[in-house]
C-alpha cells in the first residue's frame, strides 16, 4: 500500500521537516526558518508557536516539532500545551476571583495552585489528630484515642488483643 | 489598531519617585484588567502588580508593597503605576498587559512595547 501510494502521490515521500512543494514539480523543500512539519507529506509548515509576554521558551522550535512554552515565575500552566498562565499564590491560600486568599479555618493548601482542602477527620478512621493542621498542612493522624490511654505510649508495642466483650478486670 | 503605550519612565535617584502610563487605544479598558511586569537585563519577566476591571488590586512581587501603587482612569483610557521609594534592584524595562481578569494570562493579550526605569545615582 506504501509503495501504491507513493507512486500516486510524490508528496508521501517528503519526511518530517520539509513539505511537498507544488510551486517546484512537488519536491521536498525543507520548512523555512519558524516553520516545523511533524509529519511526513504535508504540503505545507505550520508556523512556530512564539513564547512571549509571560510565556518562556521551554523548548525552541524545530523543523520537525513546535516550540513549546512555560510559564514566567510566579505564574504556572494551565490549559492543554499551556495556553494560559495562571497566577501562583502561596502554600496556605487559594486563588479566587478577587486574588490569592488565605484558606478557611479548617481547610489547608500546601501548593502554590489549587484550591484549599478539608483537613483530614482522623475520628473517621477512628485515630486521634497527632499534629494540628495549618492553612498549609493537613493535620497528623495518630493511634486511636483507646491506644493513648493513660500508661499507654504510641512507642510501646500495642497489649494483646482481648477477646471482644470482655474488659479488664 | 489596538495597541497599549507605556510612558513615564526615565532616569531616578534611589529613593525618588516615577508615574509610569499605560494607554489603550482602539479599544476600551473598562473591561479589562491591566497588569503591570517588568524585566531586568539578564532576569526573566516578572509581575508587578495588576488592576481588574472593577479595581480590585494583585500584588504579584511582594518587594514592591507600600511601594507603588497602581490605578486607572477609564475616562482618559488610562493605567498609571505609582512608583515611590524606588531602589535600583527596580531597574527594569516596565510593561503594560491587558488580559481578561489579573489571575490568568493567554497568548492572545495585548502587550506594550516597555518603557525604560534606571534607578542610579
Known amino acids: 500500500f506504501e509503495r501504491t501510494r507513493s507512486l500516486q502521490d510524490p508528496c508521501s515521500n517528503c519526511p518530517a521537516g520539509t513539505f511537498c512543494d507544488n510551486n517546484r514539480n512537488q519536491i521536498c523543500s525543507p520548512c523555512p526558518p519558524n516553520s516545523f512539519s511533524s509529519a511526513g507529506g504535508q504540503r505545507t509548515c505550520d508556523i512556530c508557536r512564539q513564547c512571549k509576554g509571560v510565556f518562556r521558551t521551554r523548548k525552541e522550535c524545530s523543523s520537525t516539532s513546535n516550540a513549546e512554552c512555560d510559564c514566567t515565575p510566579g505564574f504556572h500552566c494551565l490549559g492543554a500545551g499551556c495556553s494560559m498562565c495562571e497566577q501562583d499564590c502561596k502554600q496556605g491560600q487559594e486563588l479566587t476571583k478577587k486574588g490569592c486568599k488565605d484558606c478557611c479555618f479548617g481547610t489547608f493548601n500546601d501548593q502554590k495552585r489549587g484550591i484549599c482542602r478539608p483537613w483530614t477527620n482522623c475520628s473517621l478512621d477512628g485515630k486521634s489528630v497527632l499534629v494540628n493542621g495549618t492553612k498549609e498542612r493537613d493535620v497528623v493522624c495518630g493511634p486511636s484515642p483507646a491506644d493513648l490511654s493513660p500508661g499507654a505510649s504510641s512507642v510501646t508495642p500495642p497489649a494483646p488483643a482481648r477477646e471482644p466483650g470482655h474488659s479488664p478486670q | 489598531q489596538l495597541q497599549l503605550v507605556e510612558s513615564g519612565g526615565g532616569l531616578v535617584q534611589p529613593g525618588g519617585s516615577l508615574r509610569l502610563s499605560c494607554a489603550a487605544s482602539g479599544f476600551a479598558l473598562d473591561y479589562s484588567a491591566i497588569g503591570w511586569f517588568r524585566q531586568a537585563p539578564g532576569k526573566e519577566r516578572e509581575g508587578v502588580l495588576c488592576?481588574?476591571?472593577?479595581?480590585?488590586?494583585?500584588i504579584y512581587a511582594d518587594s514592591v508593597k507600600g511601594r507603588f501603587t497602581i490605578s486607572r482612569d477609564n475616562a482618559k483610557n488610562t493605567v498609571y503605576l505609582q512608583m515611590n521609594s524606588l531602589k535600583p534592584e527596580d531597574t527594569a524595562v516596565y510593561y503594560c498587559v491587558a488580559p481578561r481578569i489579573c489571575s490568568t494570562y493567554s497568548s492572545d493579550d495585548y502587550w506594550g512595547q516597555g518603557t525604560q526605569v534606571t534607578v542610579s545615582s
Open positions: 488592576i481588574s476591571s472593577s479595581g480590585d488590586v494583585t
